[in-house]
């Protein structure tokens, strides 16, 4: 047989025995001659170094580049590959020689009393026990012990090959301490040398330190660090630690194997480092190394040692937090301290407790911030050992994107009479106040709610061509007043007004307010009519159970068929900012009302009377008139508000008081209610009559008693009455001091 690649024009060495395999008997002589084209050498089994005394390699007598290998009295151990090769090349010819020695069928390694077989427990792996044979066709089995087990070739994963040895899946013999091969020849058993079975595992999956990070202690405390190595099975582990003062007196190291679940393919080892009475010099990096021999893994953690317990705020602690309404706000308590402090949060001095809207812990979390959350938050850190306290104030400012108050009025806006001057208003609430409020406009017919226009929440208006009010060409002449600031419902609001100097064309107006956190807008439908005009009789908002008339007046020569309607409820929900359908184009939502027609010289007047108005009568009333020539419908809308009846209530500063003679008393009694109540004053249950010293002003709201005299002393009552009843408040006025001599006794008696 030949091995290697032929190099330039060099033939392989030629052996005198032209066979791949040669079988000879023990005690005979083996002689092979090798001829070639340059210097040759021989290699033979068991002694590749050429120092074997029994083997003789001689130059041939009949030529150059020829060597003969001779072994007299061969033994079983001479079985193997004999190789003739050119020096310094791979070109070689090989013959495998079996020396049949039935007394020693297995080839023994020269120096070995026993061999070693390394295996892993992997189910897929096979191991070869190198019991080579001096006879090619032996019946060989493998014996393993203890307990004793015999494995016989099965033509599959268990086999024996004279040149290779016995092949078997490694897990089958992983239990065994030793194995050997056995051959049966003529009922006689022959054994190979013993092979010690070493189950090899080396892989370390990971090394984990516990605690893994953030280890803090103060001087004198005990440090306990656990280092766990997870490995494959059959692994032994060496642990080692590296730390700042490795020659520590009070150090203790304990290594042990941890129990793992049966069937687990993993083993756990634990090394515990304990230092009693830690010192500042022990601060630093602690590293644990685990090593199996073939693999080393390390992990580290930093141990911080403090001189004594302490607490302080970290440099990153905020003093101002800004948020927008609806956001989640997180204010972390950034601290340095050992041990970790107790943390308590306060708002304006009141302790905060966690609930579904707020979580007060290491981080103060407000789930959905609202305006009322604005304020000063104090976090107090307390060291649990030293009881040292540190406090820090965080101001939370909650911003509000612009909200336009009138936006809630979704119903159709009143129609406006042609040629009149009108004022449109946007009342904006925003924090911080809007840095600008801009007005825009567009002709009504360019922005009708046609079905072809898709209205979405993100783009609620089909109107796209908004123009600045500065450019009022083709529209109404406009003037924007300077923004006003007003306290409305306890909130500072910005009021922007737009004055339409003459209502000539129907249009839509939009006010847009912007601040640092958002924008808000309101669209106002400004429908101009030359048609009928609606007036209210009496000209004020009615209260429940009062009567009111709505008059619709139209020029008789221009209009006919005057009719009153009430606008039914709009289909809900209406998208924020969605424009109502022009009333005249959608008569389906109108309810026809009974009314009475009157006429004068030029006009028809259709009067719709509401007797005993109720809250249900509130709403939008539509007067519809038809142009006599064009038959085009004109409609006017008026929103009617019916005020709820409210029994009288009194507010004001009526309190018992003591006054000196000659001074003045001023008290007020503010009453509210609907209908507005009448106010009356009584002294000692008698109606108080005005005279030079007693003055009642502002519908009896304010009472002034000038230059009080002793007889002004008494019980004063303010009573507010309406059809719904009366409310009253009382106060006793004491008058002190001396008057004229004649009254001295009386005065003394009073005291």
């Amino acid at each position: 047989a030949s091995v290697g690649l032929p190099s330039v024009s060099l033939d392989l060495p030629r052996l005198s025995i032209q066979k791949d395999i040669l079988t000879i008997k023990a005690n005979t002589t083996l002689q092979i001659t090798c001829r070639g084209q340059r210097d040759l050498d021989w290699l033979w089994p068991n002694n590749q170094s050429g120092s074997e005394q029994r083997v003789e390699v001689t130059e041939c007598s009949d030529g150059l580049f020829c060597k003969t290998l001779t072994i007299p009295k061969v033994i079983g151990n001479d079985t193997g590959a004999y190789k003739c090769f050119y020096r310094e090349t791979d070109l070689a010819s090989v013959i495998y020689v079996y020396v049949q020695d039935y007394r020693s069928p297995f080839i023994a390694s020269v120096s070995d009393q026993h061999g070693v077989v390394y295996i892993t427990e992997n189910k897929n792996k096979t191991v070869v026990i190198p019991c080579l044979g001096s006879i090619s066709n032996l019946n060989v089995s493998l014996c393993a012990r203890y307990p004793e087990k015999r494995f016989v070739p099965d033509g599959n994963r268990i086999s024996w090959d004279s040149k290779k040895g016995f092949t078997i899946p490694s897990y089958m013999i992983s239990y065994a301490g030793m194995v050997f091969c056995e051959a049966k020849i003529n009922d006689e058993s022959y054994q190979s040398i013993m092979y010690i079975v070493v189950v090899v595992g080396y892989r370390i999956y990971d090394v984990v330190l516990s605690p893994s990070h953030g280890i803090e202690l103060s001087v004198g405390e005990k440090l306990v660090l656990n280092c766990t190595a997870r490995t494959e099975l059959n692994v032994g582990i060496d642990f080692n630690w590296e730390y700042p003062s490795s020659k520590h007196q009070h150090k203790k190291l304990v290594n042990r194997d941890l129990k793992t679940q049966s069937g687990s393919e993993m083993k756990k080892f634990l090394s515990t480092l304990t230092i009693d009475g830690i010192t500042r010099s022990d601060q630093g990096l602690y590293t644990c190394a685990a090593s199996s021999g073939l693999m080393t893994k390390k992990n580290s953690t930093f141990v911080r040692v403090h001189e004594k317990p302490f607490v302080a705020f970290g440099s990153g602690m905020e003093s101002l937090v800004e948020a927008t309404v609806g956001e989640r706000v997180r204010i972390p308590a950034k601290y340095l301290g050992y041990p970790p402090p107790e943390i308590k949060w306060y708002k304006n001095g009141i302790p905060l407790e966690s609930n579904h809207t707020i979580k007060a812990g290491h981080v103060l979390t407000i789930m959905e911030v609202s305006e009322r959350d604005t304020g000063n938050y104090t976090v107090i850190l307390t060291n649990p050992i030293s009881k040292e306290k540190q406090s820090h104030v965080v101001s939370l400012v909650v911003y509000v994107p612009p909200q336009i108050g009138e936006k809630s009025l979704i119903s159709p806006v009143d129609s406006y009479q042609y040629g009149t001057t009108q004022t449109l208003t946007c009342t904006v609430y925003a924090i911080p106040p809007p840095h600008h409020i801009h007005w825009y406009w567009q002709l009504e017919e360019e922005c009708a709610n046609e079905p072809s226009h898709a209205v979405s929440v993100t783009n609620p208006y089909p109107c796209e061509e908004w123009r600045s009010v500065e450019d009022f060409q083709g529209g109404n002449k406009i003037e924007v007043n300077k923004n006003q600031f007003a306290l409305i419902e306890g909130k500072n609001k910005t009021v922007s007004t737009l004055v339409i100097q003459a209502a000539n064309v129907s249009a839509l107006y939009k006010c847009e307010a912007v601040n640092k956190v958002g924008r808000g807008e309101r669209v106002i439908s400004f429908h101009v009519t030359r048609g009928p005009e609606i007036t209210l009789q009496p000209d004020m908002q009615p209260t429940e159970q009062e009567s009111v008339s709505l008059w619709c007046t139209a020029d008789r020569s221009t209009f006919e068929n005057l009719t009153w309607y009430k606008l039914g409820p709009q289909p809900l929900p209406i998208h924020v900012g969605e424009l109502p359908t022009p009333v005249c184009k959608n008569l389906d939502t109108l309810w026809k009302l009974n009314a009475t027609m009157f006429s004068n010289s030029t006009n028809d007047i259709l009067i719709m009377e509401l007797k005993n108005a109720s809250l249900q009568d509130q709403g939008d009333y539509v007067c519809l008139a038809q142009d006599r020539k064009t038959k085009k419908r004109h409609c006017v809308v008026r929103q009617l508000t019916v005020l709820e009846r409210v029994a009288p209530t009194i507010t004001g500063n009526l309190e018992n008081q003591t006054t000196s003679i000659g001074e003045s008393i001023e008290v007020s009694c503010t009453a509210s209610g609907n209908p507005p109540p009448q106010i009356m004053w009584f002294k000692d249950n008698e109606t108080l009559v005005e005279d030079s010293g007693i003055v009642l002003k502002d519908g009896n709201r304010n009472l002034t008693i000038r230059r009080v005299r002793k007889e002004d002393e008494g019980l004063y009552t303010c009573q507010a009455c309406s059809v719904l009843g009366c409310a009253k408040v009382e106060a006793f006025f004491i008058i002190e001091g001396a008057q004229e001599k004649t009254n001295l006794e009386h005065h003394h008696h009073h005291h």
Partner: antibody, heavy 117, light 112 residues
Framework: EVQLVESGGDLVKPGGSLKLSCAAS????????MSWVRQTPDKRLEWVAS????????YYADSVEGRFIISRENAKNTLFLQMNSLKSEDTALYYC??????????WGQGTTLTVSS | HIMITQDELSNPVTFGESVSISCRSS???????????LNWFLQRPGQSPQLLIY???TRASGVSDRFSGSGSGTDFTLEISRVKAEDVGIYYC?????????FGSGTKLEIK
């Protein structure tokens, strides 16, 4: 700076013995597994032996099993390879290598062993 | 044992070009932890081997990003982009999936 310096290489007769040393510096020797790797004259690299950080666990290539012994002296930052029953095929340049995660991340410059009669 | 096969010589390459060096294993080096345990070393002339790549594709500390490793369970490639003079030497691959750890015979990087 990590340094590994091998010494002890020599010319030895077949069957003879020799002890190689590797002096380590620039790192905590006792926290790393150590290995010997040899490079044969035909430039092939062959892993020879490995030892765990504390010296309790040793591994050998089949070709040197029973003949070579790897050991370490952590106090002196030194790794050893005792080689007995030397054969001509042991002729090689012997490197000591530092091991972490199974990887040989630093190697020495090597020391040469020649086995010849 | 796992056999690692490498070509003796790479295709000669000109400075600035890219070169691929291949390595084949007789058995998959993909371990059950999902990692592929194959390393690449470079031995420059007159120097000891230096770890370039571990776990098939992770560059060792201080190794230029011109070196990149890739492969499957048994076939692996070391790619060197923009070859420089200092890249000359013998490149070895090594398997760490099964004991004993074995090296390839090495591939010599040839420059035109």
């Amino acid at each position: 700076e990590v340094q590994l310096v091998e010494s002890g290489g020599d010319l030895v007769k077949p069957g003879g013995s020799l002890k190689l040393s590797c002096a380590a510096s620039g790192f905590t020797f006792s926290m790393y597994g150590m290995s010997w790797v040899r490079q044969t004259p035909d430039k092939r690299l062959e892993w020879v032996a490995s030892i765990s950080i504390g010296g309790s666990y040793t591994y050998y290539a089949d070709s040197v099993e029973g003949r070579f012994i790897i050991s370490r002296e952590n106090a002196k930052n030194t790794l050893f390879l005792q080689m007995n029953s030397l054969k001509s095929e042991d002729t090689a340049l012997y490197y000591c290598a530092r091991e972490l995660d199974g990887n040989y991340d630093y190697w020495g410059q090597g020391t040469t062993l020649t086995v010849s009669s | 044992h796992i056999m690692i096969t490498q070509d003796e010589l790479s295709n000669p390459v000109t400075f600035g070009e890219s070169v691929s060096i291949s390595c084949r294993s007789s058995k998959s080096l993909l371990y059950k932890d999902g990692k592929t345990y194959l390393n690449w070393f470079l031995q420059r002339p007159g120097q000891s081997p230096q770890l370039l790549i571990y776990l098939m594709s992770t560059r060792a500390s201080g190794v230029s990003d011109r070196f990149s490793g890739s492969g499957s369970g048994t076939d692996f490639t070391l790619e060197i982009s923009r070859v420089k003079a200092e890249d000359v030497g013998i490149y070895y691959c090594q398997q760490l999936v099964e004991y004993p750890f074995t090296f390839g015979s090495g591939t010599k990087l040839e420059i035109k």
